[in-house]
Interface confidence: medium
């Protein structure tokens, strides 16, 4: 039954990957992994998202051998680097290979780091917001999603993606405006429930 639930989840992920595409899947993965591994750096989460997307693409295309290999490689990487990913992985990483991946996929959220700085400093107040956004849009939005998600394990992934979309729309509009900062200064007010 655990197996049934797991394969139903996998089918749902495949359907989402097919329907919404790789970019949307990566955004979902950034949000979920950031909630699960809030102590991991953005670089680490980005790497896990890239690898996870590859695993799901292969699994969904029916390339079962590649899928199993890459899944095992990802579990191995996570366990070898658990000190910089999450303190909750110890038990999973002691399990045999076949159980390891499933256990990691279901692992509880790690504790949030203490005294995380305000998000506004980097994403609203910084003079480099439009410069950073223009340089690598998806990366900058990914970083926003990571920072927001790791601070809000209580939010649904759907809500986090909606907030990231609002932020993206605001930057698209404001970074072309005469006074970008004035334009996006109140963007976080739109996030209030």
């Amino acid at each position: 039954d655990e197996g049934k639930a797991s394969s139903a989840k996998q089918r749902l992920k495949c359907a989402s990957l097919q329907k919404f595409g790789e970019r949307a899947f990566k955004a979902w993965a950034v949000a979920r992994l950031s909630q699960r591994f809030p102590k991991a750096e953005f670089a680490e989460v980005s790497k896990l998202v890239t690898d996870l997307t590859k695993v799901h693409t292969e699994c969904c295309h029916g390339d079962l051998l590649e899928c199993a290999d890459d899944r095992a490689d990802l579990a191995k990487y996570i366990c070898e680097n658990q000190d910089s990913i999450s303190s909750k992985l110890k038990e999973c990483c002691e399990k045999p290979l076949l159980e390891k991946s499933h256990c990691i996929a279901e692992v509880e959220n790690d504790e949030m780091p203490a005294d995380l700085p305000s998000l506004a400093a980097d994403f609203v107040e910084s003079k480099d917001v439009c410069k950073n956004y223009a340089e690598a849009k998806d990366v900058f939005l990914g970083m926003f999603l990571y920072e927001y998600a790791r601070r809000h394990p209580d939010y649904s992934v759907v809500l986090l993606l909606r907030l990231a979309k609002t932020y993206e729309t605001t930057l698209e509009k404001c970074c072309a405006a005469a006074d970008p900062h004035e334009c996006y200064a109140k963007v976080f007010d739109e996030f209030k429930p």
Epitope: E41, F42, A43, E44, K47, N81, A136, V139
Partner: nanobody
């Protein structure tokens, strides 16, 4: 924890060239902005060059090295390079590589989390 190991330093005559390399221990290297700093004896550590994360399509240089030094990265090899041409005696220093996942790119040392041990560059006249 990211370990950074620099190599390529040495003794060279004024006008000569050197290529420094900095290799990172992590497969997550792609998500780090990388920078080179230098410290001459009795002087403050100073910014030399930086390259942005991921594609590395944005670079920045200290005015003193613009047009002479070039920073680049090879994500497949987890390595960042500093090609130094037209070296001058005042370029003599220990060159240190640094990594940051806090910003797309930065010239500020306080925004870098990880530092190498450094490699000595000596330019004789």
């Amino acid at each position: 924890e990211v370990q950074l190991v620099e190599s390529g330093g040495g003794l060279v005559q004024a006008g000569g060239s050197l290529r420094l390399s900095c290799t990172a221990s992590r497969r997550a290297f792609i998500g780090y902005a990388m920078g080179w700093f230098r410290q001459a004896p009795g002087k403050e550590r100073e910014f030399v060059a930086a390259i942005s994360w991921f594609a590395g399509d944005t670079t920045d240089y200290a005015d003193s090295v613009k047009g002479r030094f070039t920073i680049s990265r090879d994500n497949a090899k987890n390595t960042v390079y500093l090609q130094m041409n037209g070296l001058k005696p005042e370029d003599t220093a220990v060159y240190v590589c640094a990594a940051s996942s806090a910003r797309p790119m930065s010239g500020r040392s306080d925004e870098y989390h990880y530092w190498g041990q450094g490699t000595q560059v000596t330019v004789s006249s």
